[in-house]
Amino acid sequence: QRLPRMQEDSPLGGGSSGEDDPLGEEDLPSEEDSPREEDPPGEEDLPGEEDLPGEEDLPEVKPKSEEEGSLKLEDLPTVEAPGDPQEPQNNAHRDKEGDDQSHWRYGGDPPWPRVSPACAGRFQSPVDIRPQLAAFCPALRPLELLGFQLPPLPELRLRNNGHSVQLTLPPGLEMALGPGREYRALQLHLHWGAAGRPGSEHTVEGHRFPAEIHVVHLSTAFARVDEALGRPGGLAVLAAFLEEGPEENSAYEQLLSRLEEIAEEGSETQVPGLDISALLPSDFSRYFQYEGSLTTPPCAQGVIWTVFNQTVMLSAKQLHTLSDTLWGPGDSRLQLNFRATQPLNGRVIEASFPAGVDSSPRAAEPVQLNSCLAAGD
């Protein structure tokens, strides 16, 4: 039985600078004036962040079609980035003995690159997605998912690992990014914010969504995760944004209804198998794709990220349950568990659909096979 704990006035931070928050953050002291306890003391030696527009600059966006009930990312308005203050790089702390499983956390010391050097790599995740700059790649075919509809038995393990809520998946969930690009799902987990503060990891034109689901996959070319880590395409993650909608999402409720049982850090429970594909958007044909990294230590690169264009709708109550039920390290609420967006450093995000209108047409020139030309270059 868990002892009651006092709710934090200022929950453990992760990735959000305050500039990126929609409402109610004006009273927070600026980092320069009075750094919050969880903020890093200095990040001069770390890679900088992309300049992001403040969320309050974005008008409210309505779903495109009533039948679908889901926002499409290309519906978001294009906003010029005004050069906001950089978001802090999230940090982690590692056991002094240097255990093979590092003990890290969001918003603490030392910086993640000290936990895992790969976290200072040039091609990290998450990133800000700017549809206008995405390269339309007709070769990106609809994703194929097989075996994602699981029977109730055997049950699946749902765990509060102190960083997220994670559902371990059985073998047999097959996913193809395209011909010869086959993967099997390992686990899924979520990232979220706090009351009135969004917590997705990826952003779109600087807009941060309430939450984000990640389904982590291992390439069938590798038998073990440790062999695949850091290898191009060794791991692939399907990511979808979670948004507030008018109705309860019955698929998510199968997990969210069990969170109270795993409120304590490290606790776990068994849940009946469910349709994992129902946790994802229905449109597998429209997505963004780029090569990045794991968003937590070990931050291994070579990860193929596929971010759905369509979002998933959860009720306000469900989003509140997600962000307000679990506890993390040090008797702090498990909230704002997202990493700051990382610089693209020359990477081009590809889109499986024409995500942006090219306002500056270019002369036709030879293009290498299997390559896509970034719009607006």
Partner: antibody, heavy 122, light 107 residues
Framework: QVQLQESGPGLVKPSETLSLTCTVS????????WSWIRQPPGKGLEWIGY???????NYNPSLKSRVTISVDTSKNQFSLKLSSVTAADTAVYYC????????????????WGQGTLVTVSS | DIQMTQSPSSVSASVGDRVTITCRAS??????LTWYQQKPGKAPKLLIY???SLQSGVPSRFSGSGSGTDFTLTISSLQPEDFATYYC?????????FGQGTRLEIK
């Protein structure tokens, strides 16, 4: 190299409480699950329960009413208390680390103590 | 609770032999099965986890397979140090349970 060492009395009287401590060296107790497992002489292994470094516990229902596992992160130790013991609790008691791969969710007992024999007898 | 049943209870073999030990779960456990080796007076040693993943440092002559309810541990060519008792353990649901053990003896 992580090492685990059980300590405690080798003889406990019936109806009393068995108390054992496991000291972890060569690594931090943080970020892992720490278990107690026992093995009656000449028999198989029985999982007693685990504790996460933060204090979260999970016990075998067959022993739950009698078991308490606690952790002291400052000393890098975790402990087992088993109340109202009988001769059936005579066993070699092992402490073990339940490793957990955060990427895959796989878990396993990867480090074990050498075990300590506890005899319940008057 | 999930019952784990190993067979055979004991097996005699010679150095160089190929030996297979089976483990059956009373209900499906996906691939959440672990194999351990225990020598007299010693603690168990992790061999295989997630049904088929070889623990670091364990010789490649050990292999595991299976999914659902039926699993096997195979030693491709027995070495003198392999004579021991082998246990399977399910990690799918709580309580964690072990098989009764298979004793591998020298013929």
């Amino acid at each position: 190299q992580v090492q685990l060492q059980e300590s405690g009395p080798g003889l406990v009287k019936p109806s009393e409480t068995l108390s054992l401590t496991c000291t972890v060296s060569g690594g931090s107790i943080s970020s892992y699950y720490w278990s107690w497992i026992r093995q009656p002489p000449g028999k198989g292994l029985e999982w007693i329960g685990y504790i996460y470094y933060s204090g979260s516990t999970n016990y075998n229902p067959s022993l739950k009413s009698r078991v308490t596992i606690s952790v002291d992160t400052s000393k890098n130790q975790f402990s087992l208390k088993l109340s109202s013991v009988t001769a059936a609790d005579t066993a070699v008691y092992y402490c073990a680390r339940r490793g957990y791969d955060i990427l895959t969710g796989y878990d396993y007992f990867d480090y074990w103590g050498q075990g300590t024999l506890v005899t319940v007898s008057s | 609770d999930i019952q784990m049943t190993q067979s055979p209870s004991s097996v005699s073999a010679s150095v160089g032999d190929r030996v297979t030990i089976t483990c059956r779960a009373s209900q499906g456990i996906s691939i959440w099965l672990t194999w351990y080796q225990q020598k007299p007076g010693k603690a168990p040693k992790l061999l295989i986890y997630a049904a088929s993943s070889l623990q670091s440092g364990v010789p490649s002559r050990f292999s595991g397979s299976g999914s659902g309810t039926d699993f096997t541990l195979t030693i491709s060519s027995l070495q003198p140090e392999d004579f021991a008792t082998y246990y399977c353990q399910q990690a799918n649901s709580f309580p964690i349970t072990f098989g009764q053990g298979t004793r591998l003896e020298i013929k």
